[in-house]
Interface confidence: low
Amino acid sequence: APPCLDGSPCANGGRCTQLPSREAACLCPPGWVGERCQLEDPCHSGPCAGRGVCQSSVVAGTARFSCRCPRGFRGPDCSLPDPCLSSPCAHGARCSVGPDGRFLCSCPPGYQGRSCRSDVDECRVGEPCRHGGTCLNTPGSFRCQCPAGYTGPLCENPAVPCAPSPCRNGGTCRQSGDLTYDCACLPGFEGQNCEVNVDDCPGHRCLNGGTCVDGVNTYNCQCPPEWTGQFCTEDVDECQLQPNACHNGGTCFNTLGGHSCVCVNGWTGESCSQNIDDCATAVCFHGATCHDRVASFYCACPMGKTGLLCHLDDACVSNPCHEDAICDTNPVNGRAICTCPPGFTGGACDQDVDECSIGANPCEHLGRCVNTQGSFLCQCGRGYTGPRCETDVNECLSGPCRNQATCLDRIGQFTCICMAGFTGTYCE
């Protein structure tokens, strides 16, 4: 039998589930842990202080908890402040917590004291400098000023002028006396220790406004944006650059040391980024307002004026169209154009359309068409209804048949089919 059916092995409301290995396992509700949910979860009571994260575990049948403390706190329940949080140790000393809960600093060489802030004076502890060298204390250390003929951190070595070599930048040192030397410098350097970089720029070949930048036994040309190459002799094709050097659809033509733009209509300027002000040459009439557009302009007309330049009187002002018509003005000649509503016709839309006499009868099922102002009416024959007599009247809707008879709708009338034992028009 499945292990979970044999009476649940889970205590305290634990839910029994069967593992792939056919063993039973318990899914414990909050507050309970253990293989059979038999142990109280020690984390349930929130034993960790502050933002400490509680983790429970079961060891040898006993439920235990541990707290993962946030920065600045320590202890089994995160209730103790961390004395190292304030970085009390100076000069890179390592901070740890002592058995008394206070901080301990492991001082680096050259420093001492509880917080490693005190400098050790190495010059007072014996005489570290050899051969009569003068000891100079420095923060965290010391240095020796050696007498002539000695060298090394402690003046321990007899001075050999070329060991180590004082020659910089790859220069070769040659001993020229007991304490003297010469440096043979590599091309591009000069000076006592080859420390001076020779200026290679005099007589440079940087062209087209290129700036010479001195290198080591060489120079480089820093070119203006229009030129490139070793000596700025190579023209930069601005037309290949992204984004395009010519804006607003302008065509780019590369030139030596620059480029030129051919602008499309309506644009001007070196890179075709200026919109030509077409209002500068526009002639809007009668106090109209000119609005510049790309390669065109627009005149905003005052009341009563129309046309591209507002030079025409607006014929619509006098309401020449029938009341429901829409009036527009012809921008060329200023005349009114009336757009008629359904049922009206004519230049001013004031003539009624006789819908009954144009084309086929609009009324269905032989209905009679009657013209009206702007529309028409249909007078329907018996048995039909609707605006165009398109709907058959269902005479059965009023339930005229009696004694459970069946009603049959007919055009303009109805028929009752009577039950056995009844007769009459209505089976009455």
């Epitope: 930048n169 790859g170 590599l186 591009g188 290198g215 080591v216 060489t218 190459g229 070793q230 190579e234």
Partner: antibody
Framework: QVQLVESGGGLVKPGGSLRLSCAAS????????MNWVRQAPGKGLEWVGR??????????HYAASVKGRFTISRDDSKNTLYLQMNSLKTEDTAVYYC?????????????WGQGTLVTVSS | DIVLTQPPSVSGAPGQRVTISCSGS????????VSWYQQLPGTAPKLLIY???QRPSGVPDRFSGSKSGTSASLAITGLQAEDEADYYC???????????FGGGTKLTVL
């Protein structure tokens, strides 16, 4: 845009010869010093040699490992760099790249070609 | 003969900062500029840093270079998966009129 395309690589027996080409486009070829750099399979980059443009003297320098066996040349009228490899050894097996030298100071190689593989094997 | 020394490999997690060192001598790095190249798997090297610390256009400012004495280093901040590649330092040796490359460093993004 600036482009370098190498060709001529292939399989050759030890002691044999091969000529690599590098076709350049998109810049004034004669103004630039050109370099060959190689990379043995799974290994690092090794400089092979360089040739200055004719207008700057056309001087040529080689790495010690190829001196006397390899010859670098250029044809500025064809915008093409060449590497003639003679007396090939198995250790010459590598991808060979050509690269434009933007400045000798600091070895500024930009751009590089896609490379061509030379295999020296018996 | 490799005359510029680089660590064979470095690694870092996404978002981290890594540095690659390049050690030379007074006859190469000591008196010249250093360049750095990035070589993504199966592709040709690409210029990453020139004149010790200059970035070509198109190279993100996460990449930076520096030089001190006879050593140079490349730093990459905010590490991304696409930074996984081989990195080479390079300079010019004036004494032998030749270019030299470091042995290369393989960067792995964990």
């Amino acid at each position: 845009q600036v482009q370098l395309v190498e060709s001529g690589g292939g399989l050759v027996k030890p002691g044999g010869s091969l000529r690599l080409s590098c076709a350049a486009s998109g810049f004034t070829f004669s103004s630039y010093t050109m370099n060959w750099v190689r990379q043995a399979p799974g290994k690092g980059l090794e400089w092979v040699g360089r040739v200055k443009g004719e207008q700057f003297g056309g001087s040529i320098h080689y790495a010690a490992s190829v001196k006397g066996r390899f010859t670098i040349s250029r044809d500025d009228s064809k915008n093409t760099l060449y590497l003639q490899m003679n007396s090939l050894k198995t250790e010459d097996t590598a991808v060979y790249y050509c690269a434009r030298e933007r400045s000798r100071a600091g070895s500024i190689f930009d751009p590089w070609g896609q490379g061509t593989l030379v295999t020296v094997s018996s | 003969d490799i005359v510029l020394t680089q660590p064979p490999s470095v690694s870092g997690a996404p978002g981290q900062r890594v540095t690659i060192s390049c050690s030379g001598s007074s006859s190469n790095i000591g008196f010249n500029y250093v360049s750095w190249y990035q070589q993504l798997p199966g592709t040709a090297p690409k210029l990453l840093i020139y004149y010790n610390n200059q970035r070509p256009s198109g190279v993100p400012d996460r990449f930076s270079g520096s030089k001190s004495g006879t050593s140079a280093s490349l730093a990459i901040t905010g590490l991304q998966a696409e930074d996984e590649a081989d990195y080479y330092c390079s300079t010019w040796t004036g004494t032998s009129e030749s270019h030299v490359f470091g042995g290369g460093t393989k960067l792995t993004v964990l």
